[in-house]
Interface confidence: medium
């Protein structure tokens, strides 16, 4: 064909407002003398006389011009049908992009401005090589790689298996029928960390403790447990109607509240980020709530945390987990046993 | 060479319908326009509508909206016009002709359509 | 609609006369304007297109001239098969219309 199909439907042919269009008679060879009519139009818009051969140019188009135009040869064969769409070549899109565990990252996409065209997206992704490394430039091992769009959601794409300490560029072309332009993006994993809230988190009364919760949770399904990729924790905590949070970071996945207000329902919330402090704070979870017992009042064990710290009593063994209720900065972190009084006093102490 | 046949006559009653036939020969049907025109003695030549057979589009004479239905079989080179609800006011030689979008190039000889009780 | 008027309404000339028909547009229409000619019992043929180009396998004596609203058909020197009657018919808006027409007749 004389018209070089421009990415969108058949049929179409594109241009910018304000600007020039030459449209193309698809049904003819190229250079053939043809007549130009608007669809709906009898008049004659361009006769084959004009030396343009299949070819219509419109000076400066704008909205009214968009629709459809009629070509044909000199001796009436039919050339076909044109239709004309008005819009912007592509800006740069903006893109952002997250993790919610370590080896994994996605990114989103959003145009820099409204074509009004058919618009598709080009991602991809490479590691970036340190200085001085001049030799792995066109390694295989540093990509591009291709990210995969998200099939269920559109304007994201992820990158799976990703090295934590490696920095990645990030690709995303948009491209419309008008043209096509770059957004480069240097990501990081541990600066673009930000773990889903943590997930089951329960509230339960203590009882004959009218001023004590017992808060319990779990990691986040989208976090995969390894020694070396440990999360911390955030807890806050309020009595209804109270306008301000308290705020505790716990060790492991719970935490007894000593200074709740007796006989109130209270609301308690969690947030965990990675225990080095990659990235940022998780959103807090969903709400929980919780109301202290009413029963007989309990001697109170000493407080050996000012208020907010575990109780030897409210410690309960992590069966559903064999992460560390505590992290160590040792090479190979042990599971702490909470099932041993000494080993937890000896933490607590 | 270029032929568009079409029947000589019709002789129809008031308030019925007739289709009326005009076969293309020497030529790739699909490429052009096909329009019917409606002649009487005293009102001229009066445009009905084109259709292109290579995708049934038309347009119509608005005044003619109602009157007519232009279709086509390719599988035949044949053009189709179907006149309805007759009055006398209809009786007419109707000439199909090939041509461009808006001209016309190639006649058929016309059909004489009487509408008579 | 466009209104094309045609004048004379009948014209009586000699053959090897000169002749000019003339078409009024009732509104501007550009080059938008073709003429026809129909012998007695015949279909009509495309004569000139676009107010003055020339069809293929048409004499070179018929010639038309015009633009806007007012155009001609001229006839260098008339030959018998000249006389018959000529339609104007403009194309520059739906629905397509034609001139009554005027029919030119031996003297």
């Known amino acids: 064909s004389p018209c070089p199909q421009a990415w969108g439907p058949p049929g179409v042919q594109y241009g910018q407002p304000g600007r020039p269009v030459m449209l193309c008679c698809p049904g003819v060879s190229a250079g053939t003398p043809v007549s130009w009519f608007r669809d709906g139009d009898s008049r004659l818009l361009q006769g084959p006389d004009s030396g343009l051969g299949h070819r219509l140019v419109l000076a400066q188009v704008d909205s009214p011009d968009e629709g459809t135009y009629v070509c044909q040869t000199l001796d009436g064969v039919s050339g076909g049908m044109v239709t004309l769409k008005l819009g912007f070549p592509p800006a740069r899109p903006e893109v952002s992009c997250q993790a919610v565990d370590y080896e994994n990252f996605s990114c989103t996409w959003s145009p820099g401005q409204v074509s009004g065209l058919p618009t598709r997206y080009l991602t991809s992704y490479r590691k970036k090589t340190l200085p001085g490394a001049e030799s792995q430039r066109e390694s295989p091992s540093t990509g591009p790689w291709p990210c995969p769009q998200d099939p269920l959601e559109a304007s994201r794409c992820v990158v799976h298996g990703a090295e934590f300490w490696s920095e990645y560029r990030i690709n995303v072309t948009e491209v419309n029928p008008l043209g096509a332009s770059t957004c480069l993006l240097d990501v990081r994993l541990q600066s673009i960390l930000r773990p889903d809230p943590p997930q089951g988190l329960r509230v339960e009364s203590v009882p004959g403790y009218p001023r004590r919760l017992h808060a319990s949770w779990t990691y986040p399904a989208s976090w995969r447990r390894q020694p070396h990729f440990l999360l911390k924790f955030r807890l806050q905590y309020r009595p209804a109607q109270h306008p301000a949070w308290s705020t505790v970071e716990p060790i492991g996945l719970e935490e007894v509240i000593t200074d709740a207000v007796a006989g109130l329902p209270h609301a308690v919330r969690v947030s965990a980020r990675d225990f080095l402090d990659a990235g940022t704070w998780s959103a807090w979870s969903p709400e929980a709530w919780g109301t202290p017992s009413t029963g007989p009042l309990q001697d109170e064990i000493p407080d050996w945390s000012q208020g907010h710290g575990q109780q030897l009593e409210a410690v309960v063994a992590q069966e559903d987990s064999p992460a560390p209720a505590r992290p160590s900065l040792q090479p190979d972190p042990r599971p702490l046993d909470h099932r041993d009084p000494l080993e937890q006093v000896a933490v607590l102490a | 060479q270029v032929q568009l046949q079409q029947p000589g006559a019709e002789l129809v009653r008031p308030g019925s319908s007739v289709k009326l036939s005009c076969k293309a020969s020497g030529y790739t049907f699909t490429n052009y326009w096909m329009h019917w025109l409606k002649q009487r003695p005293v009102q001229g030549l009066e445009w009905i509508g084109n259709?292109?057979?290579?995708?049934?589009?038309?347009h119509y004479n608005q005044k003619f909206k109602d009157k007519a239905t232009l279709t086509v079989d390719k599988s035949s080179s044949t053009a189709y016009m179907q006149l309805n609800s007759l009055t006398s006011e209809d009786s007419a030689v109707y000439y199909c002709?090939?041509?461009?979008?808006?001209?016309?190039?190639?006649w058929g000889q016309g059909t004489l359509v009487t509408v008579s009780a | 609609d466009i209104v094309l008027t045609q004048s004379p309404a009948t014209l009586s000339l000699s053959p090897g006369e000169r002749a000019t028909l003339s078409c009024r547009a009732s509104?501007?229409?550009?080059?938008?304007l073709h003429w026809y000619q129909q012998k007695s019992h015949e279909a009509p043929r495309l004569l000139i297109k676009y107010a003055s180009q020339s069809i293929s396998g048409i004499p070179a004596r018929f010639s038309g001239s015009g633009s806007g609203t007012d155009f001609t058909l001229s006839f260098s020197s008339l030959e018998t098969e000249d006389f018959a009657v000529y339609f104007c018919?403009?194309?520059?808006?739906?629905?397509?219309?034609f001139g009554q027409g005027t029919k030119l007749e031996i003297k």
């Open positions: 018919q403009q194309s520059y808006s739906w629905p397509l219309t």
């Open positions: 259709i292109g057979p290579s995708d049934s589009k038309t």
């Open positions: 002709a090939r041509g461009d979008y808006v001209l016309f190039t190639y």
């Open positions: 509104q501007s229409i550009s080059n938008n």
